[in-house]
C-alpha cells in the first residue's frame, strides 16, 4: 500500500509569547513545529515515529495564521507519506517550538525551547474530506486539519490496491475509485485484454484482435463469418459446412456445373413443343403436328401429310392447302368419285364393286397393288418395318430386313448382347451400346476393357473421353471426369440421349 497523511496547520495563538516552562520569549516566540506520526497507542509514549515525522521552518512569531503553500520551505499542508496498508488508526504528536536561530532550519539550532504540544489518538478513514480540530491549553491554541489520501495509482479503504491505467496489449482500462478495473470501450475480460468483436460475429467461426472486428476462420466468409465457403469452382451449389458443393435443384456433377434441368432453365423447345430432360445439358423436343427441327423451330409444309386422295395433287396455301383432283374425283381431299364401275376405274386387274346403289364404287386389288384404283404397286419397305437402323430390301412379293451388327430378328428387333461374353476385366461393369460394349472400370483400373492397372497418376492414361477434364485426389486411388456439354458417364463416354435410367454419375 501507499498513501499520504496530510496535516494542514491553520492558526497558532500564543498571545503572551510564553514558553512551556513559564518563561517568555525575547523579543517574541519565533515558532516552528515538529510533527510525529505513529501507530495507535492508547497512551502516547516516546519512541520512533513509526509512520513518519516532519519539521517546519519558522512559520511566525507568537500568534499567526499559516497560509497554504505547495512547495519550498514551509510547505503547508505537511506531507507524511507511508508505504504500507493504512491501518485506519493513528497517534499524532504536534509540538510548537521557539528557536533563536535559523528561520529555515530551526531544527538544527541549539537552544530551542518547547512552547506547547498536543497529542491526538484515534481512527481515520482514507478520504478526501479534511477533519478539522482545535486544541487549547492555558497559554496557546492551535487550529488544524488532517486527512489520509492514497498515493497516485493506489486505491481502496486502506490504499492497498495498486491500479495503473493502461492501454496496450496487456490491458485496456482505467481505474475506478475502489481500484477495480474499468474497461475502455470495446474491451472486456478480467484484465480488459479481450476485444469485443463486431456485434453478431459468429462465436466459433469468427474472431477479432481489436474491437468491432470480425475475422473469419478458414472456410467461412461474410461480415459476421456465418457463411460457409463452398468448394472452389462450385457453380450452382451451396454449402452448410466449408468446402461442400451441394447442388441446387436441376444441377449435378462434382462442381454442380452440369445442367440436369435444361428444359426449365433454358426453354429450348419452340412452337408449343414438349421438352424432356435427358441428362446434363441434354434434352429432346417433341413437336406438335406441323413442326419439325431439333427445337421444333421449323414449320412443316401443310401438304406434308399427303392429304389429297385418289391421285390428287396438293398445293400449299398461306394457312392451308388445296387439292387439285384428277378427272372423275372431287371434294376437299378428292375423296368423292364421279366414276362408276361402268367406267372401268380399277387398274392392274382390280375388280370393281358398286356402292350406294351404283353411285360409287370400290376396287379390290390383286396382290402387290394398292390405292383406291389399284394404281400403286406395293412397296413393302414404305412402313419402315426394320428396327434399330436395319435396311429394308424388296424381294419380289416380300421384303427382308438387313440388320446392323448387334441386332437380329425378322425386323432386327432382337438385341444381341455384347456383354454376354463378359468382356470387362477386373470387375468392370459392362454396358451394351450401339457401337459395341463399353466398360465402366473400378478404382485402380482403366482401358476400354479395364485391362490396365493404374499404378501412378490416375489421369496420366487419359481416361476421360470427349474432351472431359480429369481430376485426381478427389477420391482414394481414383480420378473424376468433369464432362463437357453433351456427355455423361464416369469417363464421359456416353453421349446425351441415353435412356434416363442409364447411370452417368461418376
Amino acid at each position: 500500500g501507499s498513501g499520504i497523511f496530510q496535516l494542514r496547520l491553520q492558526e497558532f495563538v500564543n498571545q503572551r509569547g510564553m514558553l512551556a516552562n513559564g518563561q517568555s520569549c525575547e523579543p517574541g516566540c519565533r515558532t516552528f513545529f515538529r510533527i510525529c506520526l505513529k501507530h495507535f497507542q492508547a497512551t502516547f509514549s516516546e519512541g520512533p515515529c513509526t509512520f513518519g515525522n516532519v519539521s517546519t521552518p519558522v512559520l511566525g512569531t507568537n500568534s499567526f495564521v499559516v497560509r497554504d503553500k505547495n512547495s519550498g520551505s514551509g510547505r503547508n499542508p505537511l506531507q507524511l507519506p507511508f508505504n504500507f496498508t493504512w491501518p485506519g488508526t493513528f497517534s499524532l504528536n504536534i509540538q510548537a517550538w521557539h528557536t533563536p536561530g535559523d528561520d529555515l532550519r530551526p531544527e538544527t539550532s541549539p537552544g530551542n525551547s518547547l512552547i506547547s504540544q498536543i497529542i491526538i489518538q484515534g481512527s481515520l478513514a482514507v478520504g478526501k474530506i479534511w477533519r478539522t480540530d482545535e486544541q487549547n491549553d492555558t497559554l496557546t491554541r492551535l487550529s488544524y486539519s488532517y486527512r489520509v489520501i492514497c498515493s497516485d495509482n493506489y486505491y481502496g479503504e486502506s490504499c492497498s490496491r495498486l491500479c495503473k491505467k493502461r492501454d496496450d496489449h496487456f490491458g485496456h482500462y482505467e481505474c475506478q475509485p475502489d481500484g477495480s478495473l474499468s474497461c475502455l470501450p470495446g474491451w472486456t475480460g478480467k484484465y480488459c485484454d479481450q476485444p469485443i468483436c463486431l456485434s453478431g460475429c459468429h462465436e466459433q467461426n469468427g474472431y477479432c484482435s481489436k474491437p468491432d472486428e470480425c475475422i473469419c476462420r478458414p472456410g467461412w466468409q461474410g461480415r459476421l463469418c456465418n457463411e460457409c465457403i463452398p468448394h472452389n469452382g462450385c457453380r450452382h451449389g451451396t454449402c452448410s459446412i466449408p468446402w461442400q458443393c451441394a447442388c441446387d435443384e436441376g444441377w449435378g456433377g462434382l462442381f454442380c456445373d452440369q445442367d440436369l434441368n435444361y428444359c426449365t432453365h433454358h426453354s429450348p423447345c419452340k412452337n408449343g413443343s414438349t421438352c424432356s430432360n435427358s441428362g446434363p445439358k441434354g434434352y429432346t423436343c417433341t413437336c406438335l403436328p406441323g413442326y419439325t427441327g431439333e427445337h421444333c423451330e421449323l414449320g412443316l409444309s401443310k401438304c406434308a401429310s399427303n392429304p389429297c386422295r385418289n391421285g390428287g395433287s396438293c398445293k400449299d396455301q398461306e394457312n392451308s392447302y388445296h387439292c387439285l383432283c384428277p378427272p372423275g374425283y372431287y371434294g376437299q381431299h378428292c375423296e368423292h368419285s364421279t366414276l362408276t364401275c361402268a367406267d372401268s376405274p380399277c387398274f392392274n386387274g382390280g375388280s370393281c364393286r358398286e356402292r350406294n346403289q351404283g353411285s360409287s364404287y370400290a376396287c379390290e386389288c390383286p396382290p402387290n397393288f394398292t390405292g383406291s384404283n389399284c394404281e400403286k404397286k406395293v412397296d413393302r419397305c414404305t412402313s419402315n418395318p426394320c428396327a434399330n437402323g436395319g435396311q429394308c430390301q424388296n424381294r419380289g412379293p416380300s421384303r427382308t430386313c438387313r440388320c446392323r451388327p448387334g441386332f437380329t430378328g425378322t425386323h432386327c428387333e432382337l438385341h444381341i448382347s455384347d456383354c454376354a461374353r463378359s468382356p470387362c476385366a477386373h470387375g468392370g461393369t459392362c454396358h451394351d451400346l450401339e457401337n459395341g460394349p463399353v466398360c465402366t472400370c473400378p478404382a485402380g483400373f482403366s482401358g476400354r476393357r479395364c485391362e490396365v492397372r493404374i499404378t501412378h497418376d490416375a489421369c496420366a492414361s487419359g481416361p476421360c473421353f470427349n474432351g472431359a477434364t480429369c481430376y485426381t485426389g478427389l477420391s482414394p486411388n481414383n480420378f473424376v471426369c468433369n464432362c463437357p456439354y453433351g456427355f455423361v458417364g464416369s469417363r464421359c463416354e456416353f453421349p446425351v440421349g441415353l435412356p434416363p435410367s442409364f447411370p452417368w454419375v461418376a
Partner: antibody, heavy 121, light 106 residues
C-alpha cells in the same frame, strides 16, 4: 509446468534471414492469458525485447526492429516462430523465447534456455 | 524511444540491504517488472507490477515505483543473490528493458 525450447540454426550468413522456432510443452499456446515473446541478448550485453504474439496471431514488435521482424504462431504444433531478415554481425546474440503473462501485467514468467545465433560468413 | 536507466553496478555486504534503481520518464505511471539473471542462465522474474512477487521468490525481494524511479530492494542480501538485475516496462505496445545492474555481494 510450462516449458519453452528454442530451435534453429546456430550460424547465419550476413544478409540472410534468421529463423527460430519455440516449442511450448506442458501448456497450450492457445490460452488467451499469455503472449509469446522473443528477447535477445548480445554477448556481454543487456536484454533487448524483439516482439510478441498471441494465439490468434496479433503481433507487436520493437519499433527499432519492426521492418525486419516477423513472428508467427502455429497452434496445431504448439509453436511460435521468429524470422529476422537482412541480418548483420550486430544480430549475433543469445535468442530467448518467453511467456508473458497478462495476469502479471506482461511480466515474462517462463523462459527458454536460449540459443546462440552467430552471424558470420 | 522510451529508455530505462540503471546503475551499472551495486555492491553490498552479506546480510545488508541492496537497492537497485531504475529511472524513466513518468515511470511511476507504468508497471515495472524485475528480472534476475545469473551467468549462463536464462532470466528469472522476481517482481512484477512494481511490487508483486511470483510464487517461489523469497520475501527478501521487494519493489516500489513512484515518480520517475522504480526500486528493487534486496534485504538481508545473500551470496546467492549475486547476479545481473534488469528492470522492464511497457511503453505503448513495446517492451523496454533497462541497461542492467550487476549486484556484487562482498
Amino acid at each position: 509446468e510450462v516449458q519453452l525450447q528454442e530451435s534453429g540454426p546456430g550460424l547465419v550468413k550476413p544478409s540472410e534471414t534468421l529463423s527460430l522456432t519455440c516449442t511450448v510443452s506442458g501448456g497450450s499456446i492457445s490460452s488467451g492469458s499469455y503472449y509469446w515473446g522473443w528477447i535477445r541478448q548480445p554477448p556481454g550485453k543487456g536484454l533487448e525485447w524483439i516482439g510478441d504474439i498471441n494465439y490468434i496471431g496479433s503481433t507487436y514488435y520493437n519499433p527499432s526492429l519492426k521492418s525486419r521482424v516477423t513472428i508467427s504462431v502455429d497452434t496445431s504444433k504448439n509453436q511460435f516462430s521468429l524470422k529476422l531478415s537482412s541480418v548483420t554481425a550486430a544480430d549475433t546474440a543469445v535468442y530467448y523465447c518467453a511467456r508473458e503473462a497478462v495476469s502479471f501485467g506482461g511480466g515474462a514468467d517462463s523462459w527458454g534456455q536460449g540459443t546462440l545465433v552467430t552471424v558470420s560468413s | 524511444s522510451y529508455e530505462l536507466t540503471q546503475p551499472p553496478s551495486v555492491s553490498v555486504s552479506p546480510g545488508q540491504t541492496a537497492s537497485i534503481t531504475c529511472s524513466g520518464d513518468r515511470l511511476g505511471d507504468k508497471y515495472v517488472s524485475w528480472y534476475q539473471q545469473k551467468p549462463g542462465q536464462s532470466p528469472v522474474l522476481v517482481i512484477y507490477e512494481d511490487s508483486q512477487r511470483p510464487s517461489g521468490i523469497p520475501e527478501r525481494f521487494s519493489g516500489s515505483n513512484s515518480g520517475d524511479t522504480a526500486t528493487l530492494t534486496i534485504s538481508g542480501t545473500q551470496a546467492m543473490d549475486e547476479a545481473d538485475y534488469y528492470c522492464q516496462a511497457w511503453d505503448m505496445e513495446a517492451g523496454v528493458f533497462g541497461s542492467g545492474t550487476k549486484v556484487t555481494v562482498l
